[in-house]
């Protein structure tokens, strides 16, 4: 959906936010041109980008919330999420600096769609909870907050240990959109009945 | 009301340091990230430096990064803006101003009237 | 970073005469269905004030007069029909990624 739009569409919201879902979570989108761009294309870096133990919340966690938790916890989550992906942002190098170095262009351009697409992603989910009546939840764009955000480890002047981190942060990222799939594929045909 | 007042300003030789606040009033402030924004007289805006609304993220234009630290008091309701190894193109009024967003950056709705600082020997 | 080229530099207009601001960015600020671009304004003596978001959504309190458009690399800021306290210097900004930049600024005047 666009800034500020909602549809009324129950179904065609929850194929959108399934379609986004299954877009976030290919790692061919974030995490693999992140890691050619950083120079961790290495078997033996590659095996220290590990998903940290309670980034974000689990798959059967997501399950157990109910619809309405759910998309608050969702909307939390993608709230870090965004800040996260402005900061190694601000670290990649610059256009200039990869074409002079061989690396692909293209990457860098992936790269910088994902916090578009996360925040599409999040309006979507503003609008779904706006369709199940969820007057808690804040609009994205706007001040405030959805819900409480546990506080975000504040990352690591070291180089190195940063790219292994949002090496990391982004393999959490790809399984956790991929738990949100799930969890989107179990909502029923209408946002009164859910499928088991 | 919604206000932002910035303070600190003055004259300062190069090399040195300087440190800016802006109290912020008539609204959740801990709620918002925040940003310094700058004007060197007669010319144009620049966007200087963004903290995330708990303070765990920082973000800053190029030629300040090493010089300038953004940070805030989320209990004091206090942004600062920590300038050293000042330079003479860095004499501008800086703008304290409140992002819309408060998880990431769209625009900023709410300004400050400035404080001059001057850089000069 | 992404240049902001804001033209014209500046501009005359009779009152109740219509004044077009345009803004080409050096690469598209549009990503994911949104417009990474706002407008502001700023009078002598005052800070910037913001009177468009997302290219085209009109801040609250922002007389109907002031509209933008655009998407990709070119926006416009359109004031249908001048008013005396519209004379200022107006701004674009981009928010697509870091470093945020501004435009050089369009003063309005009356001519």
């Known amino acids: 959906a666009a800034m500020g739009s909602c549809s009324k569409e129950y179904r065609m919201l929850l194929g959108q936010l399934q379609k986004q879902t299954d877009l976030m979570q290919d790692t061919s989108r974030l995490l693999d041109p992140y890691i050619r761009i950083q120079g961790l294309d290495i078997p033996k870096l590659r095996e220290h980008c590990r998903e940290s133990p309670g980034a974000f919340p689990s798959e059967e966690t997501l399950r157990g919330l109910g619809r309405r938790g759910f998309l608050q916890t969702l909307n939390a989550t993608l709230g870090r999420v965004l800040h996260r992906l402005a900061d190694l942002e601000q670290h990649l190098p610059k256009a200039q600096d990869l074409e002079r170095s061989g690396l692909n262009i293209e990457d860098l351009e992936k790269l910088q769609m994902a916090r578009p697409n996360v925040l599409g992603l999040r309006n979507n989910v503003y609008c779904m909870a706006q369709l199940l009546d969820n007057s808690d939840m804040t609009e994205p764009t706007k001040a405030g907050r959805g819900t409480p955000q546990p506080p975000t480890p504040t990352p690591t002047s070291d180089v190195f240990q940063r790219k292994l981190e949002g090496c990391s942060f982004l393999r959490g990222y790809h399984r956790f959109m991929h738990s949100v799939g799930r969890v989107f594929s179990k909502w029923g045909e209408s946002p009164n009945r859910s499928r088991r | 009301e919604v206000q932002l007042v910035e303070s600190g300003g003055g004259l300062v030789q190069p090399g040195g340091s300087l440190r800016l606040s802006c109290a912020a009033s008539g609204f959740t402030f801990s709620n918002y990230a925040m940003s310094w924004v700058r004007q060197a007289p007669g010319k144009g805006l620049e966007w200087v430096a963004t903290i995330s609304d708990g303070g765990s993220f920082t973000y800053y234009l190029d030629n300040v990064r090493g010089r300038f630290t953004i940070s805030r008091d989320n209990a004091k309701n206090s942004l600062y803006l920590q300038m050293n190894s000042l330079r003479a193109e860095d004499t501008a009024v800086y703008y304290c101003?409140?992002?819309?967003?408060?998880?990431?950056?769209?625009?900023?709705?709410?300004w400050g009237r400035g404080t001059l600082v001057t850089v000069s020997s | 970073d992404i240049v902001m080229t804001q033209s014209p530099d500046s501009l005359a207009v009779s009152l109740g005469e219509r004044a077009t601001i345009n803004c080409r960015a050096s690469k598209s600020v549009s990503a994911a269905g949104y417009n990474f671009m706002h407008w502001y304004q700023q009078k002598p003596g005052q800070p910037p004030k913001v009177l468009i978001y997302?290219?085209?959504t009109r801040e609250s309190g922002v007389p109907d007069r002031f509209s933008g458009s655009g998407s990709g690399t070119d926006f416009t800021l359109t004031i249908s029909s001048l008013q005396a306290e519209d004379v200022a210097v107006y701004y674009c900004l981009h928010s697509r990624e870091f470093p945020f930049t501004f435009g050089g600024g369009t003063k309005v005047e009356i001519k």
């Open positions: 101003a409140r992002d819309v967003g408060h998880t990431t950056f769209w625009y900023f709705d709410v």
């Open positions: 997302w290219a085209s």
